[in-house]
């Protein structure tokens, strides 16, 4: 009897949908695996007789529930199927946006870039998929614990009237208000402000 794959799960970030599993202990030799998806009531092969423990399902429709399954094989024997259901638009993890930061005197000028999507045109981003897409920004003085959060209305934001000659750190994430779903924070970007622009009278 061939044991089934273990710890079967979907790892999906920005619609890069990778079905992953672990190979069970099997004394007779090396196992191979076949992964399938349900399409119009028929299961279709996606990865056949692979020695890998993952299979790329990024070409699935972003919409709807998908049934995926994987089994282990050895010679002419095979395990039972292990099934999972997956809805990309609901289940995919929102990866960190890009961010460009520029210091202008005592201000930080930030521009945000929505995450790109696997198997899409360069210009079709997570912002196109989710109508309610917005950004959360948090910033803090480097070396302090107090963080401030803002929700920019646009793809850019300016933090004004900051303390001069002080290092501020900023990070951004995508947020979907209608789903109350937050994405992953970007890596902090830390920049030092320069002089206060106000001219003494």
């Amino acid at each position: 009897m061939v044991p089934p794959p273990e710890n079967v799960r979907m790892n999906s970030v920005n619609f890069k949908n990778i079905l992953q599993w672990e190979s069970p202990a099997f004394a007779k030799g090396n196992l191979t695996f076949t992964a399938q998806y349900l399409s119009y009531r028929i299961f279709q092969d996606k990865c056949m007789n692979t020695t890998l423990t993952e299979c790329d399902f990024s070409s699935l429709s972003k919409y709807g529930d998908h049934t995926l399954r994987v089994r282990a094989e050895f010679a002419d024997e095979h395990s039972d199927w292990v099934n999972i259901t997956f809805c990309p638009v609901d289940d995919t993890i929102i990866g960190p946006p890009g961010m460009q930061v520029e210091v202008l005197a005592d201000s930080l000028h930030m521009r945000f870039l929505a995450p790109k999507i696997e198997n899409e045109y360069e210009t079709w981003t997570m912002k196109n998929v989710y109508n309610s897409w917005t950004y959360n920004v948090q910033y803090w003085k480097n070396g302090t614990d107090e963080k401030f959060q803002i929700t920019p209305q646009y793809d850019f934001e300016v933090l004004r009237n900051l303390e001069p000659w002080t290092t501020y750190c900023v990070q951004v994430r995508g947020f979907l208000p209608d789903r109350n779903k937050a994405g992953e924070w970007s890596e902090p970007v830390c920049e030092q402000t320069t002089h206060d622009e106000t001219v003494p009278s």
């Epitope: 429709s61 210009t123 998929v129």
Partner: nanobody, 124 residues
């Protein structure tokens, strides 16, 4: 059942132009996303371009950027693909497709309705 009907294909010399049209028979083309795909002889389906209804944004494959322009005329319920500076490698059957959910642009899996296609041949 929605039927999409493409027209405007034909034989054109390299460097020439064509304008493809797509209409929905008896229906409006009021879908969140409408796109053009193509299939060259012996190859798979390839996304060419799409237009999003929500913000009228247009999106293109790298291979056609700057040469092809997608547009829609809501008053005529028609989608267009203006193809300029055509090359031999643009030879394919071109399909119009519409998505009910509008979540994707390039992947054929994200589209629900398809036309029968119109042949474009670029040859001297």
């Amino acid at each position: 059942e929605v039927q999409l009907v493409e027209s405007g294909g034909g034989l054109v010399q390299p460097g020439g132009s064509l304008r493809l049209s797509c209409a929905a028979s008896g229906n409006s083309l009021d879908y969140p996303t409408i796109g053009w795909f193509r299939q060259a002889p012996g190859k798979g389906l390839e996304g060419v371009s799409c237009i999003s209804a929500s913000d009228a944004s247009t999106h293109y494959a790298d291979s056609v950027k700057g040469r092809f322009t997608i547009s829609r005329d809501n008053s005529k319920n028609t989608l267009y693909l203006q193809m300029n500076s055509l090359r031999a490698e643009d030879t394919a059957v071109y399909y119009c497709a519409a998505s009910l959910h509008g979540l994707g642009c390039k992947s054929e899996a994200d589209y629900d309705y398809w036309g029968q296609g119109t042949q474009v041949t670029v040859s001297s």
